[in-house]
């Protein structure tokens, strides 16, 4: 058992049938010695006296909040809650599986330039009775600051028959230098507690694997003279990390119809402008990526042909 | 026909086309060592994330845009003296910062170019002849090198008498190439920055 | 299976033209954009042209601006290489060729051989 | 017009020995270069495009790599199949270019 925060405690269980559980014993936090009552959620149904009381703890019935009184008073509450482990496994029940970039992956966090700041998403069927807290460092032995926001429901999904809810955190590091050479990892922590059940998630990366630009801004056409061919220029974006002649991008520019598998025209370039053909009712397209470092493409940025 | 854009002629920084060519060569080598020695730990997960210059160089501060010597979390005071006498740029063009930051590159390349060299050495002695380092990797570091010009120290190849144990040998190519290719691409930054300049 | 069909060898007088045919089977014919490449003997290969069989769109190399013209029949899939002012330095395979991408190619025929002799 | 150089023009190699073939453009063409095999007599076929990017159905012992005006294909182990004539080609601007070629001949 260990102390979550104050009056929550996270009792570990091995969980398989007829498993012995966890004797635990909770403390009154009172100067009282004697006339001290125990109880557990709502009930009024006496479970011991005095002030300590052992329990054995072996599932979700015996997890909740147990409360010592005394004559009608309440004195102090303990919160338990199980973390179960199966076939020596933590569970992964609250939070679903987002297979990307490989199985087992339920944070998923990206970084739109070097400043230290990223954001974190989880993915989860479940609706209610549902809190989230998050930690973050750089490093884990000898940890660097990172300061975490609240994590806050950011899109509602319907899969199929199920409603899928999106959370998302913003972290920002502490100290951090663009320019510096990442050696140390930052770690992420994110406990989840759906009613009694409690879970914990992390992620392990390094900023400059999580970089995805904004897509380019300002996107214009030139159409050039006697030609089908047009010239399309562009923009960093405003939130990418200066000066840029040191943070470069590099860009793919595509022109396609509405469908994926009609044909293209596409060109890569390090500069701001390119050439290509543009058809009736086609698209051109444009996106960035780090020059130096290929984490992933930002999303495109667009403008009809027409 | 693609507009002309303006650019500066590459001519004037001979060391940009260098330094692109030195991450592609290192980010090949990477990538060849990843496949071939799939069972070993090799992936940047699976690794020691160790800097071979730390306390040697300073190439990231040395080679702090200007813009970016405000940020106070950028600016570590480690002093360290080089040598001043690049010849990546006109000499005009060559201030005192500059040249630290060229030299702190250089002094990079030599610390990796004796490591690599050593390690391949051992490599070569590896009955299962697994991998070896790529040439053009290392002729793209001398490359980069003759083109910085700086005189200094030859650093002595590093021999050992024992027997190599190639495990080791092979997790610790990995970690150097991992490194390496943050460097160059802190390098290949640098020099275009420079050449924007 | 994607296959580009090509017309039969060709041998010319100088100062004439030759037209190579080039029918498409496979995948719809307005779906790919259509190149000609040629390889004179013993040499290497030269962009001509390419098509867009939708609209007709055409784009040419310089050299052979003028005396080039590439032309598409989508009832028939099929897409034409006129060649005039013929010269002997026009003696090549003349290969079509298809790709969804504009700027590269996937898919070639199997050449036409166009001799240009007096 | 892009011009594209290749080396070797002729490159003699053991079968199950690597080689390397250069391709070098006039000007800085980013990733927009693409390699092609012909055998003689036959019709070109792609390898790899933008540089890098491998083609389905193409053997995973051909590589490219390079970016702006340097680019490498490489066999890592050279089949009986593999001695023909191989082009790059760049798609930066047009006219679209080719390389002169380079004959991969057994040694």
């Known amino acids: 058992i260990w102390e979550l925060k104050k009056d929550v405690y996270v009792v570990e269980l091995d969980w398989y049938p007829d498993a012995p559980g966890e004797m635990v014993v909770l403390t009154c936090d009172t100067p009282e010695e004697d006339g001290i009552t125990w109880t557990l959620d709502q009930s009024s149904e006496v479970l011991g006296s005095g002030k300590t009381l052992t329990i054995q703890v072996k599932e979700f019935g015996d997890a909740g909040q147990y409360t010592c009184h005394k004559g009608g008073e309440v004195l102090s509450h303990s919160l338990l809650l199980l973390h179960k482990k199966e076939d020596g496994i933590w569970s992964t029940d609250i939070l679903k599986d987002q297979k990307e970039p490989k199985n087992k992956t339920f944070l998923r966090c990206e970084a739109k330039n070097y400043s230290g700041r990223f954001t974190c998403w989880w993915l989860t069927t479940i609706s209610t009775d549902l809190t989230f807290s998050v930690k973050s460092s750089r490093g884990s032995s000898d940890p660097q600051g990172v300061t975490c926001g609240a994590a806050t429901l950011s899109a509602e999904r319907v899969r199929g028959d199920n409603k899928e809810y999106e959370y998302s955190v913003e972290c920002q590091e502490d100290s951090a230098c663009p320019a510096a050479e990442e050696s140390l990892p930052i770690e992420v922590m994110v406990d989840a507690v759906h009613k009694l059940k409690y879970e914990n998630y992390t992620s392990s990366f390094f900023i400059r694997d999580i970089i995805k630009p904004d897509p380019p801004k300002n996107l214009q056409l030139k159409p050039l003279k006697n030609s089908r061919q047009v010239e399309v220029s562009w923009e960093y974006p405003d939130t990418w990390s200066t000066p840029h002649s040191y943070f470069s991008l590099t860009f793919c520019v595509q022109v396609q119809g509405k469908s994926k598998r009609e044909k293209k025209d596409r060109v890569f370039t390090d500069k701001t402008s390119a050439t290509v053909i543009c058809r009736k009712n086609a698209s051109i397209s444009v996106r960035a990526q780090d020059r130096y470092y290929s984490s992933s493409w930002s999303e495109w940025a667009s403008v009809p042909c027409s | 026909r693609n507009l002309p854009v303006a650019t500066p002629d590459p001519g004037m920084f001979p060391c940009l086309h260098h330094s692109q060519n030195l991450l592609r060569a290192v980010s090949n080598m990477l990538q060849k060592a990843r496949q071939t020695l799939e069972f070993y730990p090799c992936t940047s997960e699976e690794i020691d994330h160790e800097d071979i210059t730390k306390d040697k160089t300073s190439t990231v501060e040395a080679c702090l845009p200007l813009e970016l010597t405000k940020n106070e979390s950028c600016l570590n005071s480690r002093e360290t003296s080089f040598i001043t006498n690049g010849s990546c740029l006109a000499s005009r063009k060559t201030s005192f910062m500059m040249a630290l930051c060229l030299s702190s590159i250089y002094e990079d390349l030599k610390m990796y170019q004796v490591e690599f060299k050593t390690m391949n050495a051992k490599l070569l002695m590896d009955p299962k002849r697994q991998i070896f380092l790529d040439q053009n990797m290392l002729a793209v570091i001398d490359e980069l090198m003759q083109a910085l010009n700086f005189n200094s120290e030859t650093v002595p190849q590093k021999s050992s008498l024992e027997e190599p144990d190639f495990y080791k040998t092979k997790i610790k190519l990995c970690i150097l190439l991992h490194a390496f290719r943050i460097r160059a691409v802190t390098i290949d930054r640098v020099m275009s920055y420079l050449n924007a300049s | 299976q994607v296959q580009l069909v090509q017309s039969g060898a060709e041998v010319k007088k100088p100062g004439s033209s030759v037209k190579v045919s080039c029918k498409a089977s496979?995948?719809?014919?307005?779906?790919?954009?259509l190149h000609w490449v040629r390889q004179a003997p013993g040499q290497g290969l030269e962009w001509m042209g390419w098509i867009d069989p939708e609209n007709g769109d055409t784009e040419y190399a310089p050299k052979f601006q003028g005396r080039v013209t590439i032309t598409a029949d989508e009832s028939t899939s099929t897409a034409y290489m006129e060649l005039s002012s013929l010269r002997s330095e026009d003696t090549a395979v003349y290969y079509c060729?298809?790709?969804?991408?504009?700027?590269?190619?996937?898919?070639w025929g199997q050449g036409t051989l166009v001799t240009v002799s007096s | 017009d892009i011009v594209m150089t290749q080396s070797p023009l002729s490159l003699p190699v053991t079968p199950g020995e690597p080689a390397s073939i250069s391709c070098r453009a006039s000007?800085?063409?980013?990733?927009?270069l693409h390699w092609y095999q012909q055998k003689p007599g036959q019709a070109a076929r792609l390898l790899i495009a933008?540089?890098?990017q491998s083609i389905s159905g193409v053997p995973s012992r051909f590589s490219g790599s390079g970016s702006g005006t340097d680019f490498t294909l490489t066999i890592s182990s050279l089949q009986p199949e593999d001695f023909a004539t191989y082009y790059c080609?760049?798609?930066?601007?047009?006219?679209?270019?080719f390389g002169q070629g380079t004959k991969v001949e057994i040694k």
């Open positions: 000007q800085s063409i980013s990733i927009n």
């Open positions: 060729a298809r790709n969804k991408e504009l700027r590269y190619i996937d898919v």
């Open positions: 496979g995948g719809t014919f307005s779906d790919y954009y």
């Open positions: 933008f540089a890098s």
């Open positions: 080609q760049q798609s930066n601007s047009f006219p679209l270019t």
